[in-house]
């Protein structure tokens, strides 16, 4: 079906991956579609097959090289097209001139760990994964802590407006189980968005010392 509402969105992870999602209302699940990448100043062309992720959306990853290799720069433009098979020919369903550093979404932060925990506070650190050296320190983070009896959506967001890969959580309740998540975003790019949330890190505050005021 051609007349359904379509959407084609791609993000660059800043190193060697462009991830794309194509959605179209009313499209047939068994339609064969692919994303074709044609850079303006590189010798390679790349194609990935769009695979269904839900009733009306498909996704694929253009893997440009080794995970930590810097495959694109701020001056690159990659023309991305969604091509769907119609009989014996391929039809262009969507097209964009993709500017990688205007469309960034980094990988979720990794290696979350508790550096130090007390009764009322906890120091947590993390690392960023596959992030370009071009950013230098131009990154920001959001973090959230899941308290007992609440949902992630209710958790207040803590904003770190600089490249700070640690946080000291305070005013915690003693002897309580918490979970913590963090995400990262470069400051660069008109269409840049937050990374996925990290895997949650579970930790427990220390119990209050007996006979002491808490």
């Amino acid at each position: 079906a051609v007349n359904g509402t379509s959407q084609f969105t791609c993000f660059y992870n800043s190193r060697a991956n462009i991830s794309c999602v194509w959605s179209q209302d009313g499209a047939l699940q068994d339609t064969s579609c692919q994303v074709h990448a044609w850079p303006d100043r590189r010798r390679w062309n790349q194609t990935c097959e769009l695979l269904p992720v839900s009733q009306a959306s498909w996704a694929c990853n253009l893997i440009l090289g080794a995970p930590d290799s810097q495959k694109l720069t701020t001056v690159d433009i990659v023309t991305l097209r969604v091509l769907c098979r119609e009989g014996v020919r391929w039809r262009v369903m969507a097209i964009q001139d993709f500017k990688p550093f205007e469309n960034l979404r980094l990988m979720a932060p990794i290696s979350l760990q508790v550096v130090h925990v007390e009764t009322h506070r906890c120091n947590i650190s993390w690392e960023i994964s596959q992030a370009s050296h071009y950013f230098e320190r131009h990154l920001e983070f959001e973090a959230r802590t899941l308290s007992p009896g609440h949902t992630w959506e209710e958790a207040p967001l803590l904003t770190l407006k600089q490249k700070q890969e640690w946080i000291c959580l305070e005013t915690l309740t003693p002897d309580t189980q918490y979970e913590f998540q963090v995400r990262v975003k470069p400051l660069q790019g008109e269409f840049t968005t937050w990374s996925p949330w990290s895997q949650p890190l579970a930790f427990r505050t220390k119990p209050a010392a007996l006979g002491k005021d808490t």
């Epitope: 433009i77 023309t79 097209r81 369903m93 964009q96 500017k99 269409f191």
Partner: nanobody, 126 residues
Framework: QVQLVESGGGLVQAGRSLGLSCAAS????????MSWVRQAPGKGLEWVSS????????HYADSVKGRFTISRDNAKNTLYLQMNSLKPEDTAVYYC???????????????????RGPGTQVTVSS
């Protein structure tokens, strides 16, 4: 705020050429796909042509294919439409339009624009 201003329209004889321009401001021009649409007297809006942000992809309505050429100069924030072998049925108000993202959809190219200029009148006499 986004501004699009068309120019270059006028009265021309059939078979002749005319070039339209659209000066854009208020947004990062080369981050967005652009298009030309037109409205003939007493008719609805008709999509004419679209172009990607860097100008590497273009599409045309069958009615203008081979006669019209869309282009852009991102250094000048300007969109162009070169119209050759004009016909009386090309008579219309021509509008340039900005897509809401860097993407456009060739099967439904009229969809997805969020701003349009005031238009410029093109009249083709026989």
């Amino acid at each position: 705020q986004v501004q699009l201003v068309e120019s270059g329209g006028g009265l021309v004889q059939a078979g002749r050429s005319l070039g339209l321009s659209c000066a854009a401001s208020g947004f990062t021009f080369d981050n967005y796909a652009m298009s030309w649409v037109r409205q003939a007297p007493g008719k609805g809006l008709e999509w004419v042509s679209s172009i990607t942000g860097a100008g590497r992809g273009t599409h045309y309505a069958d009615s203008v294919k081979g006669r019209f050429t869309i282009s852009r100069d991102n250094a000048k924030n300007t969109l162009y439409l070169q119209m050759n072998s004009l016909k009386p049925e090309d008579t219309a108000v021509y509008y340039c339009a900005k897509y809401s993202s860097s993407t456009y959809y060739p099967p439904t190219p009229a969809r997805g624009t969020d701003y349009r200029g005031p238009g410029t009148q093109v009249t083709v006499s026989s």
